[in-house]
């Protein structure tokens, strides 16, 4: 199963950690995909490492763990984020996070 904070908020110009936690007694994670709505943010492969989409490469840093640190947030970053865990055996598990970017006070 995937465990995540459903709703998170952060300040404009700040940073936020996008994190999904996968728990299973039998399945191993082989790949994790991160998307902002339908746009690819990053892919983690156990065998190949991290690929961060070039459009986000100056603002997205892998980690901690299989999560992402999203920096220099703008109001346009508000929206849904999806993690997809590919596991073997066990199949695919998805998690959803809604990020609200608030104006800095």
């Amino acid at each position: 199963t995937i465990d995540t904070k459903r709703n998170i908020s952060a300040e404009e110009g700040g940073s936020v950690i996008l994190q999904c936690h996968f728990s299973s007694d039998t399945a191993e994670v082989t790949q994790v995909d991160w998307k902002q709505q339908d746009q690819l943010l990053a892919i983690y492969s156990v065998d190949l490492g991290w690929h961060v989409a070039s459009v986000f490469s100056d603002r997205v840093v892998p980690g901690p763990s299989l999560g992402l640190t999203f920096q220099s947030l703008t109001m346009n970053d508000t929206g849904e984020y999806f993690c997809t865990y590919h596991t073997y055996p066990g199949g695919i598990y998805k998690g959803r996070i809604f990020l609200k970017v608030q104006e800095s006070s």
Epitope: Q31, W50, P62
Partner: antibody, heavy 119, light 107 residues
Framework: EVQLVESGGGLVQPGRSLRLSCAAS????????MHWVRQAPGKGLEWVSG????????GYADSVKGRFTISRDNAKNSLYLQMNSLRAEDTALYYC????????????WGQGTMVTVSS | DIQLTQSPSSVSASVGDRVTITCRAS??????LAWYQQKPGKAPKLLIY???SLQSGVPSRFSGSGSGTDFTLTISSLQPEDFATYYC?????????FGGGTKVEIK
Amino acid sequence: EVQLVESGGGLVQPGRSLRLSCAASGFTFGDYAMHWVRQAPGKGLEWVSGITWNSGSIGYADSVKGRFTISRDNAKNSLYLQMNSLRAEDTALYYCAKPVPKSRGLDVWGQGTMVTVSS
Amino acid sequence: DIQLTQSPSSVSASVGDRVTITCRASQGISSWLAWYQQKPGKAPKLLIYGASSLQSGVPSRFSGSGSGTDFTLTISSLQPEDFATYYCQQAFYLPWTFGGGTKVEIK
């Protein structure tokens, strides 16, 4: 004995294509990611491409992206590199390599196959 | 892409010397760094993976350390068979990248 044997290299004109093969033996090929690494004459090592055990994830060096395609056939214990639109700067010795499980260090290498791109 | 800068590019040393080669990454790569030895006309040989894990069969005079952006390969007592070129390689980010190499020559 764990072994990787590359083939398919040769002399080719710029703009043409070539397909390299790597035959694996002595280990369960389908359990491992596999990689291609090249070395131009007198130069250093350059990672070219990698592919996961099930072809689910693939990576390429920027210098070959859009021109080279890595693939594998686990039933045939074989790794391939389809090279299109070849350039003089692709001239190199091409190695296939296998990683240490879960480490991403490449512990088994073939002897290499030479690709020369020249008119 | 991650740039790996090795230094020195070459080093002259004698048998028995302690040799240290450094590899600096342009961004943090955790401990996803490997070291290879290559001799002329031969395929590279894996020495160290995971920054500090010694590959099976590699002599204990080779050691690796570091994490993040700064890494070191140390040969504690150089042997005649150690004269070769050494490369670091990162595997945290795609595309994987190699350092430019360090040639260890006989003084």
